[in-house]
């Protein structure tokens, strides 16, 4: 590694990043007929153009606009599922409940899910050694700015009843500093979104507490209400049973509280 290369605190670009993005794009457009018109090479070029040759602490939402334009996608605005710190269950849910969508069920979210990337100022190289960490280095890094941009757009598109899955096992069930708390909550449009319904997912098998009483949930309720959006909260005591009942709603055990 050359001496002059900036050392960041976070992990470097995911190996085979260009190939991964391109392969994911091809796979997604094959599976989703409404996105068959998308030219994946152009998508990769726009993605690359957002961060290559740019200082990885000086990325802006504007840098991603060409990519956003190419990845424009219409999802049913009343079928949006947001999540915070509980990605796996949210994705398991939308895999079963196919008419609901997380951000990662959209093309742009699917492309970038679990990947890291950054470039270097004035060189066309991708940095596979290290990338800026949001806390330790800078917040305007390529990955953070990407997720902030797509999350904002996703929230802005939502309408009617929006659902959010929250992790009841965490000390802060609702965290103002999460993407949901800092971006999505503030970009739901009161003229379109009537109600935010929070699903608080319990971790412990014997946990019968009403986590809708948690102070952070009441904080979320307050923030949402001040934005003229109504609020609903439900405990999901048994996530395993919850998923099972989504798969088989006719099951006799699915009439009781989950």
């Amino acid at each position: 590694v050359p001496r002059w290369r900036q050392q960041w605190s976070g992990p470097g670009t995911t190996k085979r990043f260009p190939e991964t993005v391109l392969a994911r794009c091809v796979k997604y457009t094959e599976i989703h007929p409404e996105m068959r018109h998308v030219d994946c090479q152009s998508v990769w070029d726009a993605f690359k153009g957002a961060f290559i040759s740019k200082h990885p602490c000086n990325i802006t939402e504007e840098d991603y606009q060409p990519l956003m334009k190419l990845g424009t996608q219409t999802v049913p605005c009343n079928k949006i599922l947001l999540w915070s710190r509980i990605k796996d269950l949210a994705h398991q849910f939308t895999q079963v409940q196919r008419d609901m969508f997380t951000l990662e069920d959209t093309l742009l979210g699917y492309l970038a899910d679990d990947l890291t990337w950054c470039g270097e100022f004035n060189t066309s190289k991708i940095n596979y050694q290290s990338c800026p960490d949001w806390r330790k280095d800078c917040s305007n890094n390529p990955v953070s700015v990407f997720w902030k941009t797509v999350s904002r757009r996703f929230a802005e598109a939502a309408c009617d009843v929006v659902h959010v899955m929250l992790n009841g096992s965490r000390s802060k069930i609702f965290d103002k500093n999460s993407t949901f708390g800092s971006v999505e909550v503030h970009n739901l449009q009161p003229e379109k979104v009537q109600t935010l319904e929070a699903w608080v997912i319990h971790g412990g098998r014997e946990d019968s507490r009403d986590l809708c009483q948690d102070p952070t949930i009441k904080e979320l309720e307050s923030i949402i209400s001040k934005r003229n959006i109504q609020f609903s909260c439900k405990n999901i005591y048994r996530p395993d049973k919850f998923l099972q009942c989504v798969k088989n709603p006719e099951d006799s055990s699915c009439t009781s509280e989950i």
Epitope: V161, D210, C212, F231
Partner: antibody, heavy 119, light 107 residues
Framework: QVQLKQSGPGLVQPSQSLSITCTVS????????VHWLRQSPGKGLEWLGV???????DYSAAFMSRLNITKDNSKSQVFFKMNSLQADDTAIYYC?????????????WGAGTTVTVSS | DIQMTQSSSSFSVSLGDRVTITCKSS??????LAWYQQKPGNAPRLLIS???SLETGVPSRFSGSGSGKDYTLSITSLQTEDVVTYYC?????????FGAGTKLELK
């Protein structure tokens, strides 16, 4: 099942105050808000105010100066007090439960308390 | 305050009719509209919220539509028990306000 039972006087003297208690069952006041409304032949249905699950309140500006809504979660009771009643406050007064945690419409209503303001 | 206007205070209907009740708000209420049914001597009963969402247990012959300032409640194949009074309510702004009601009466 979900019920709201109202208790309060039928007759109130002009300039006196009206107190109604709404005792709920089948749900917890820590999970739902309770709205107060009234209905009279002259003015139709009017919204007066709401107490949310956390205890905060919102009042109609027209009644804010003389209305107070409180509650006791442990007793499952909501208390409504309106001061300085006049003849045009004669109406049926209702308490009603919010459909979801914090919404502005109601799915279950009390039977109503018929209040006449007269000397 | 937002004014809610129900165009007809009463209208004559026949059993089996398709009935449409209209409600107009003085400003855009962004689908924040509820419909209630009230039988004589009873409290109002919630039928629809969010302009279109039917409450659990409400018969499917009831439906809501509309946007902006103009909303309608439709009843297909009117039944005897439906011949009562209907109110709309906006909840875009406080104070919450109601229409004056539309009373259905048999011809």
């Amino acid at each position: 099942q979900v019920q709201l039972k109202q208790s309060g006087p039928g007759l109130v003297q002009p300039s006196q105050s009206l107190s109604i208690t709404c005792t709920v069952s089948g749900f917890s006041l820590t999970n739902y808000g309770v709205h107060w409304l009234r209905q009279s032949p002259g003015k139709g249905l009017e919204w007066l105010g709401v107490i949310w699950r956390g205890g905060s309140t919102d009042y109609s500006a027209a009644f804010m100066s003389r209305l107070n809504i409180t509650k006791d979660n442990s007793k499952s009771q909501v208390f409504f007090k309106m001061n300085s009643l006049q003849a045009d406050d004669t109406a049926i007064y209702y308490c009603a439960k919010t459909t979801l945690t914090r919404v502005w419409y109601c799915d279950v209503w009390g039977a109503g308390t018929t209040v006449t303001v007269s000397s | 305050d937002i004014q809610m206007t129900q165009s007809s205070s009463s209208f004559s209907v026949s059993l089996g009719d398709r009935v449409t009740i209209t409600c107009k708000s003085s400003e855009d209420i962004y689908n924040r509209l509820a419909w209630y049914q009230q039988k004589p001597g009873n409290a109002p009963r919630l039928l629809i919220s969010g302009a279109t969402s039917l409450e659990t247990g409400v018969p499917s012959r009831f439906s809501g539509s509309g946007s902006g300032k103009d909303y309608t409640l439709s009843i297909t194949s009117l039944q005897t028990e439906d011949v009562v009074t209907y109110y709309c309510q906006q909840y875009w702004n406080t104070p919450l306000t109601f229409g004056a009601g539309t009373k259905l009466e048999l011809k």
